[in-house]
């Protein structure tokens, strides 16, 4: 198991504008530091 | 309602280092991303990058990647902005914004001068 | 990077009057999603910037119904039926889409 216990936020229950805000990746092609997928 | 609060202004020399927070209430802080945004006297906004509150993994876009840091203290619901080795051109007024820059801290003003 | 380009630089309006600004991005901004990430924001005098429309043309909470947004692809418009003395400053467009965010430079709108 994960240490970190990631939750998997449900899409569904936000509005556009916190959909936009959830911590997901930004940066889908450059090799920055960034979220993994 | 949603908030975010900063610290206050900042006068620091050349080569020293500045720690600047923001502190979100009013929604789990853990869920929403935090961008940070600089703002040189008198210009344009430019996105310095944001964090992942969930994991504490940053992304930094090219032009702060090095002397920048964000960081986080999820316990109390509060993220950082650490500049080290400053300049001149890093005085200028810094805002931190939830991810998609919805919603906005006040802005702490940070000037550096010999 | 993609760069947003705003126009006019400057918008001296009398109150009571309609303004348009206009917005161009050097890339479309519709992304993987289906959803195009280009929204405005206004800045007003010594104030902290404040999110007025996203995702194109979706008014912000507390938004006056004034305001309008539109376009799509690589060309947007932010219209005001009737300007207000509220509504001066410096109103920004900005992309969501392609790493990095970027800004356009600014609109500053002054009243008459």
């Known amino acids: 198991m994960n240490s970190f216990n990631y939750t998997t936020p449900d899409y569904g229950h936000y509005d556009d504008k916190d959909t936009l805000d959830l911590n997901t990746p930004v940066d889908k092609t450059s090799n920055t530091l960034r979220v993994p997928d | 309602q949603i908030q975010l609060v900063q610290s206050g202004p900042e006068l620091k020399k050349p080569g020293e280092t500045v720690k600047i927070s923001c502190k979100a209430s009013?929604?789990?802080?853990?869920?929403?991303?935090m961008s940070w945004v600089k703002q040189a006297p008198g210009k344009g906004l430019k996105w310095m990058g944001w964090i992942n509150t969930n994991s504490g993994m940053p992304t930094y876009t090219d032009d702060f990647r090095g002397r920048f840091a964000f960081s986080l203290e999820t316990s109390a619901s509060t993220a950082y902005l650490q500049i080290s080795s400053l300049k001149n051109e890093d005085t200028a007024t810094y805002f931190c914004?939830?991810?998609?820059?919805?919603?906005w801290g006040q802005g702490t003003t940070l000037t550096v001068s010999s | 990077d993609v760069v947003m380009t705003q126009s006019p630089l400057t918008l001296s309006v009398t109150i009571g009057q309609p303004a348009s600004i206009s917005c161009r991005s050097s890339?479309?901004?519709?992304?993987?999603?289906?959803?195009?990430?280009l929204h405005w924001l206004l800045q007003r005098p010594g104030q902290s910037p404040k999110s007025l429309i996203y995702l194109v043309s979706k008014l912000d909470s507390g938004v006056p119904n004034r305001f309008t947004g539109g376009g799509s692809g690589t060309d947007f418009t932010l219209k005001i039926n009737r300007v207000e003395a509220e509504d001066l400053g410096v109103y920004y467009c900005?992309?969501?889409?392609?790493?990095?965010?970027?800004f356009g430079v600014g609109t500053k709108l002054e009243i008459k």
């Open positions: 900005w992309q969501g889409t392609h790493f990095p965010w970027t």
């Open positions: 890339r479309s901004l519709l992304d993987s999603d289906g959803k195009t990430k």
């Open positions: 914004a939830r991810k998609s820059l919805f919603y």
């Open positions: 009013g929604y789990t802080f853990t869920t929403f991303g």
